[in-house]
């Protein structure tokens, strides 16, 4: 066991052009906080996949209000470390996600007060007990500077926090088979600790935190006896130490539950969920009382002292039905965002997202501008999962790769002739007209409808439209 510690040193604009706009304003002061998510190994995982090693949230930082006209400085940070305790061994290689969040301090009743400002991610190797490692990560125009380390919690020591040290019982030497704990030479290695709950009779371990089964036992904690009866052909058995890799015929095959009961498999056999009024292993007995335990999912049974009087199940939150056998419709709260479809699977809620959205609650608007370049100085505009390019003058098409013909729309009025030009278009006006688009008639006396022609420009000259 141990703790991963993260120290944020600064968060502010990165070097180079395009300094980000301040996240706070005089009208909407805000403060920052950080979230760290750790995953074991070096796998590239989605941002929303579980933080298997742990996660932590910082305190809120000091309130910050932008000074109008001033460039965005390094923003004020929360005090203290972010600490992620880990219970088992430190994996040595890990992936991290650090998110910078902004909390707005305006009147936010009825809507979330925070938004994600930046997210950085990386994969690192790190030995527990080592010095602080420094890092700089950039997210868009923002830069995050931070340090991190992993340290073991006593009595654990070592680069993975798997060796356990205890003070010596005798001054001169450690017990049989146990070495001194470097660098703590006055302490001794303690015996291995298997996975919590590992059966002392049927399980053993060669590495801390594992649980290996003796022959004839299986399960994560070696508490389940191996049954060979379900390992018969045609599906076949496997070795006795691991139990059956491929199950035999299912215990619910043919539904052994009578009177409308529903069957579910259990590790050893099957279980019938009986309708009200029936009980027994196969729902074969009628005349239910509270003594028969008719209320499911922790429901409280009231009345029904004898078979002729009715019982009532008072259901715990989340369950309903005469026997507390039904789940409440949690989808009625509409937890899925952005038009996602809610599915209540019993053990969890799932959202089926519309195109352009992702995440467990469809909360992520897929950034279709990511990795998509608009050519010739165009800028990418995203929305609703689609992207389009806003093209610079003179270019068009989906990615601004096509040269636009500025004359295609016939912009020159009154019979003027259009010429494409590198900076736009030029109209050569017909006699009697002038202006950038030949829109102004020249008066018969030679005076134009404009206040005056610029020096050196005669009515009838081509007018450049910039």
């Amino acid at each position: 066991a141990g703790v991963f510690e993260l120290q944020i040193h600064s968060f502010g604009p990165g070097p180079g052009p395009g300094a980000p706009r301040s996240p706070c304003s005089a009208r909407l002061p805000c403060r920052l906080f950080f979230r760290v998510c750790l995953k074991p190994g070096l796998s590239e995982e989605a941002a929303e996949s579980p933080c298997a090693l742990g996660a932590a949230l910082s305190a809120r930082g000091p309130v910050y209000t932008e000074q109008p006209g001033a460039p965005a400085p390094d923003l004020p940070l929360p005090d203290g470390l972010l600490q992620v305790p880990f219970r088992d061994a430190w994996p040595g290689t890990f992936s991290f996600i650090i998110e910078t969040w902004r909390e707005e301090l305006g009147d936010q009743i009825g809507g979330p007060a925070w938004s994600l400002l930046a997210r950085v991610a990386g994969r690192r190797r790190l030995a527990a007990g080592g010095p602080w490692a420094r890092d700089i990560q950039r997210a868009g125009a923002w830069e995050l500077r931070f340090s991190y380390r992993a340290r073991c919690e006593p009595p654990a020591v070592g680069t993975a926090c798997t060796r356990l040290c205890r003070p010596r019982s005798a001054p001169s030497r450690c017990g049989p088979g146990l070495r001194p704990c470097a660098p703590l030479e006055d302490e001794c290695e303690a015996p291995l600790v298997c996975r919590a709950g590992c059966s002392p009779e049927h399980g053993f371990c060669e590495q801390p935190g594992e649980c290996r089964c003796l022959e004839g036992w299986t399960g994560p904690l070696c508490t389940v006896p191996v049954s060979t009866s379900s390992c018969l052909s045609p599906r076949g058995p496997s070795s006795a130490t691991t139990g059956c890799l491929v199950p035999g015929p299912g215990p619910c095959d043919g539904n052994p539950c009578a009177n409308g009961g529903s069957c579910s498999e259990t590790p050893r056999s099957f279980e019938c969920t009986c309708p009200r009024g029936f009980y027994g292993l196969r729902c074969e007995v009628s005349g239910v009382t509270c003594a028969d335990g008719p209320c499911f999912n922790g429901g409280l049974c009231v009345g029904g002292a004898d078979p002729d009087s009715a019982y009532i199940c008072h259901c715990p939150p989340g369950f309903q039905g005469s026997n507390c056998e039904k789940r409440v419709d949690r989808c009625s709260l509409q937890p899925c965002r952005n038009g996602g479809l809610c599915l209540d699977l019993g053990h969890a809620l799932r959202c089926r997202c519309r195109a352009g959205f992702a995440g467990p609650r469809c909360e992520h608007d897929l950034d279709d501008c990511a990795g998509r370049a608009c050519a010739n100085g165009g800028t990418c505009v995203e929305g609703g999962g689609a992207h389009r390019c806003s093209c610079a003058l003179g270019f068009g098409g989906r990615d601004c790769r096509e040269r636009a013909d500025p004359c295609a729309a016939r912009p020159c009025a009154h019979g003027g002739r259009c010429y494409a030009h590198f900076s736009g278009l030029v109209c050569a006006c017909a006699p009697g007209y002038m202006g950038a688009r030949c829109e102004f008639p020249v008066h018969p006396d030679g005076a134009s409808a404009l206040p005056a022609a610029p020096p050196g420009l005669r009515p009838g000259d081509p007018q450049r439209y910039l």
């Epitope: 979230r35 998510c37 941002a47 929303e48 996949s49 579980p50 933080c51 742990g54 996660a55 932590a56 949230l57 009825g110 809507g111 979330p112 925070w114 939150p317 989340g318 949690r330 709260l333 509409q334 937890p335 899925c336 965002r337 952005n338 996602g340 809620l349 467990p360 609650r361 469809c362 909360e363």
Partner: nanobody, 120 residues
Framework: EVQLVESGGGEVQPGGSLRLSCAAS????????MGWYRQAPGKQRELVAG???????KYAESVKGRFTISRDNAKNTVYLQMSSLRAEDTAVYYC??????????????WGQGTLVTVKP
């Protein structure tokens, strides 16, 4: 682990008012959706009012114009102001929340319920 603690239930006469509150605490990163359900004896549990995942408010037809839901994000608390109460509003009122935990998982939680009784 996340706890939802309700308060404010009690007995009231028809036409009276009550204000329920529900405070969420624990390993919460954010609250995605939060609201109130109720269950009358022998009836199915139904949504009364809630803030959906998109942040909009939703009310059961039977309470529109009488009940108002509000929330205080800083306190992770949701309130239900109940006015013009009727006998048919008698039920156990449960707070419910769809919560994003610190580990990024989403879980749905229920409070233990608070009894509201409307009788002359």
């Amino acid at each position: 682990e996340v706890q939802l603690v309700e308060s404010g239930g009690g007995e009231v006469q028809p036409g009276g008012s009550l204000r329920l509150s529900c405070a969420a605490s624990g390993s919460i990163f954010s609250i995605n959706a939060m609201g109130w359900y109720r269950q009358a004896p022998g009836k199915q549990r139904e949504l009364v009012a809630g803030f959906t995942g998109d942040g909009s408010t939703k009310y059961a037809e039977s309470v529109k114009g009488r009940f108002t839901i509000s929330r205080d994000n800083a306190k992770n608390t949701v309130y239900l102001q109940m006015s013009s109460l009727r006998a048919e509003d008698t039920a156990v009122y449960y707070c419910a929340a769809d919560v994003q935990l610190l580990n990024t998982d989403y879980e749905f939680y229920w409070g233990q319920g608070t009894l509201v009784t409307v009788k002359p």
